[in-house]
């Protein structure tokens, strides 16, 4: 899978994580920080 950094317009896309652009899948993906989940790492869990 080809990946790259997200475009600058997606800077705020991932609330608590790193935004990765999955080129072959034509979509952005959030790699969440520890303790966070959700498509955009918007949910905190203990």
């Amino acid at each position: 899978v080809s990946i790259t950094k997200c475009n600058s317009d997606m800077n705020g896309y991932c609330l608590h994580g790193q935004c990765i652009y999955l080129v072959d899948m034509s979509q952005n993906y959030c790699r969440c920080e520890v303790g966070y989940t959700g498509v955009r790492c918007e949910h905190f869990y203990l």
């Epitope: 790259t4 317009d9 997606m10 896309y13 979509q27 955009r40």
Partner: antibody, heavy 116, light 106 residues
């Protein structure tokens, strides 16, 4: 199956406002950005602006600043684009476009005609 | 706002010809360019994103290349069904479409 279903065609008088809706199904708009693009008859594609429904952040193209308002209602999974002070040059097909989780998934378009 | 200058605005070519369209950005867009095909009365169809990544179901005669500010879209062998208007779109910083290129058969 993911869908963006837009409201029906509108005819408006110059100076009036129009509000076009874009209802998402099959996905949560909070996971995406919703962009708005228009195309006047026989003309090219023109990006108008976008909203991040989760944060409520909006960005508009400079030429529409002050005349366009993009909103989202996450409870109904619907985005809206309101354009005010309509003039004949605003006659166009208006499209909502999903981006973020999937690159550029388009609604079917809404024709807005501005005529006196 | 980033400006996208697309050329030519129209072209006429024969079936089987190689067709090339260019888009120049007013600043580096880091390969974040997409190409759309639009036929009359239809919504635009995404052909290519991230400069050169073909979408599923798009024929391999379509291709894209470029970096920095200069990008190219190519149809290696023009087919009758390719008659349409083609648009580039930068999506690095917000979004800007090129002016479009109308492709006709000679």
């Amino acid at each position: 199956q993911d869908q963006l279903v837009q409201s029906g065609a509108e005819v408006k008088k110059p100076g009036a406002s129009v509000k076009v809706s874009c209802k998402a199904s099959g996905f949560n708009i909070k996971d995406t950005y919703i962009q708005w693009v228009r195309q006047a008859p026989g003309q090219g594609l023109e990006w108008m602006g976008r909203i991040d429904p989760l944060r409520g952040n909006r960005k508009y193209r400079e030429k529409f600043e002050g005349r366009v308002t993009i909103t989202a209602d996450t409870s109904t999974n619907t985005a809206y684009m309101e354009l005010s002070s309509l003039r004949s040059e605003d006659t166009a097909v208006y499209y909502c476009v999903r981006s973020g989780t999937l690159f550029d998934f388009w609604g079917q378009g809404t024709l807005v005609t501005v005529s006196s | 706002d980033i400006q996208m200058t697309q050329s030519p605005s129209s072209l006429s070519a024969s079936v089987g010809d190689r067709v090339t369209i260019t888009c120049k950005a007013s600043q580096d867009i880091h390969k974040y360019i997409a190409w759309y095909q639009q036929k009359p009365g239809q919504a635009p169809r995404l052909l290519i994103q991230y400069t050169s990544t073909l979408q599923p179901g798009v024929p391999s005669r379509f291709s894209g290349s470029g970096s920095g500010t200069d990008y190219t879209f190519t149809i290696s062998s023009l087919q009758p069904e390719d008659i349409a208007t083609y648009y580039c779109l930068q999506y690095d910083n917000l979004r800007t479409f090129g002016g479009g290129t109308k492709v006709e058969i000679k």
